[in-house]
């Protein structure tokens, strides 16, 4: 199709080489009242379109994205050619940063309902640059945490070094929805709820004498509880003795609950005590079996191919630790009678 009639938007993505970062493009198809093309440029004021303008339909999930190759080749369907770019409804998600994402991206409705819809399309010219060292050293992260139940804020990474007074007007989106009243480089969240978790996008306009473009940054916001003040507790084993059959295989499970920590480095391991000696046992990897906002339950098993007489004289100790402290639970094996 002919893309000369598409509206054009220029965007800049300046990514940090130090952090993982995502980016999004919205299919900003023109609203009827703002449109300089689609229906309005085809109809005289007296004419009435026989179809609602595309944006009259709230369903923007039916859009098609293309990339325009720089060599003038035909448009390429994004879904077929770019595995690191994901389409979610009307949004295009770039999962990895890199200058190779630079280029022209075009979106338009999948369903062309009328001849007027042909020019209902947007061309986005995306320029991707790595952040220079000269940029602000303490810019806000692209991953920000909000503490549930308290007051917090979300900062626009590309503007976080500027004071509120000198900051340009910012346009914010949350999960693709425009937050029309938020216009500053920092959103204040009076009280944090689960609702505030999501993908936030901040845009502002930068201009030079020749043209203007939108500088965009994406922030992944996570709602968290405060760091635990407790050391982990062992849920299993509960008993300090375990009846076993000699010569049979045995698996002893250690399950421990770790409270939430922003920097989470849980330790769960098994060691064996035999008279004055003790050594750590090589056991299968620990696995998370339940994770909630407040805590995580982690399990690690010790596997004995067959229980021997020697094992009955040993103590099997599960050791768990977080930044607050550690807990142990020992198990003595006892031969099953009868």
């Amino acid at each position: 199709f002919n893309i000369s009639g598409c509206s054009t938007k220029k965007l800049l993505w300046t990514y940090s080489t130090r952090s993982e970062e995502e980016f999004v493009l919205f299919c900003d198809l023109p609203e009827p009242q703002k449109s300089h093309f689609c229906h309005r440029n085809r109809l005289s004021p007296k004419q009435v379109p026989e179809h609602l303008p595309f944006m009259g339909s709230n369903d923007l999930s039916d859009v098609q994205w293309y990339q325009q190759p720089s060599n003038g080749d035909p448009l390429e369907d994004i879904r077929k050619s770019y595995p690191h770019i994901i389409q979610d409804k009307c949004t295009l998600h770039f999962l990895t940063p890199g200058v190779n994402n630079s280029g022209s991206y075009i979106c338009r409705p999948k369903m062309i309902k009328s001849p007027y819809d042909v020019a209902c399309c947007v061309k986005m010219i995306l320029e991707v640059k790595p952040q220079t060292n000269a940029s602000c050293e303490y810019s806000a992260s692209h991953k920000q945490d909000l503490l549930l139940g308290s007051t917090g804020s979300i900062s626009c990474p590309s503007l976080s070094c500027q004071s509120d007074a000198q900051s340009p007007a910012v346009t914010w989106y949350k999960n693709g929805k425009l937050l029309s009243v938020e216009r500053s480089n920092r959103i204040v969240v009076d009280e944090v709820y689960d609702y505030h978790q999501g993908t936030y996008v901040c845009d502002y306009t930068q201009s030079d004498t020749v043209s203007s473009w939108t500088v965009r940054a994406v922030v992944q916001v996570r709602t968290i509880v405060g760091d635990t003040k407790l050391k982990p507790d062992i849920l299993d084993p509960v008993e300090d003795t375990l009846e076993v059959e000699l010569g049979k295989p045995l698996t002893i499970s250690c399950k421990a609950r770790f409270g939430f920590e922003r920097v989470f480095n849980p330790v769960i391991k098994w060691y064996i005590k035999d008279s004055d000696l003790e050594w750590e046992v090589s056991v299968p990897e620990a696995k998370s079996i339940k994770s909630t906002l407040k805590d995580e339950i982690i399990e690690r098993n010790i596997i004995l191919e067959k229980v021997t007489q020697r094992d009955l004289r040993r103590k099997f100790v599960c050791f768990v630790q977080n930044s607050i402290g550690n807990t142990t639970q020992s198990v003595q094996l006892k031969e099953k009678r009868g």
């Epitope: 308290s150 949350k174 009243v181 009076d190 009280e191």
Partner: antibody, heavy 121, light 111 residues
Amino acid sequence: EVQLEESGGDLVQPGGSLRLSCAASGFSFSSSYYMCWVRQAPGKGLEWVACIYAGSSGSTYYASWAKGRFTISRDNSKNTLYLQMNSLRAEDTAVYFCARGAGSNGDFNLWGQGTLVTVSS
Amino acid sequence: DIQMTQSPSSLSASVGDRVTITCQASEDIESYLAWYQQKPGQAPKLLIYRASTLASGVPSRFSGSGSGTDFTLTISSLQPEDFATYYCQSTIYGVNFVPNAFGGGTKVVIK
């Protein structure tokens, strides 16, 4: 008993100023509430004026027409909400209600009985 | 500011009638909408919050529905005490749950 009581309503000349107060009892301002002002002109509908967050951020929110002329504030130690109204006009004549917005629902679950402000020469 | 448009501005109905009032927001407010009832000389009373949740002590004949920009308040069988003015209100402002713009109101009068 949990209640809100407005005071300070009066007859004032156009261009004049007035400060309304709202005393809260039965709950603490420092809790996470939005304390707000809503007005109702005689025979007309409800109109949102402004809100202030009673928690630590103290964020303030205004209807676009109220920005610049009206200022909302609070004194948590006195459990009192204020509305400072300047450059008053005849169209500001209304009953001014104090209301409390709660939690993650954002609705007004508690209202005062209102105080009448009349702007006339 | 968000604009809330309520319709009709008034309606006449009889006891036992099913009454429907609609409210449209100028932008997507998800399900953050409240409905109030106001009688002459009284402060408004909360009926419904979060678009469809009945406030404490409100009779079950009142119900709310909708999300995004279009919302409805329904009174399944109008009672004599229901003749009053009803208002919708947006209860989200950016990312904060700030009660803000009201609709123009719907006056329910006896036919």
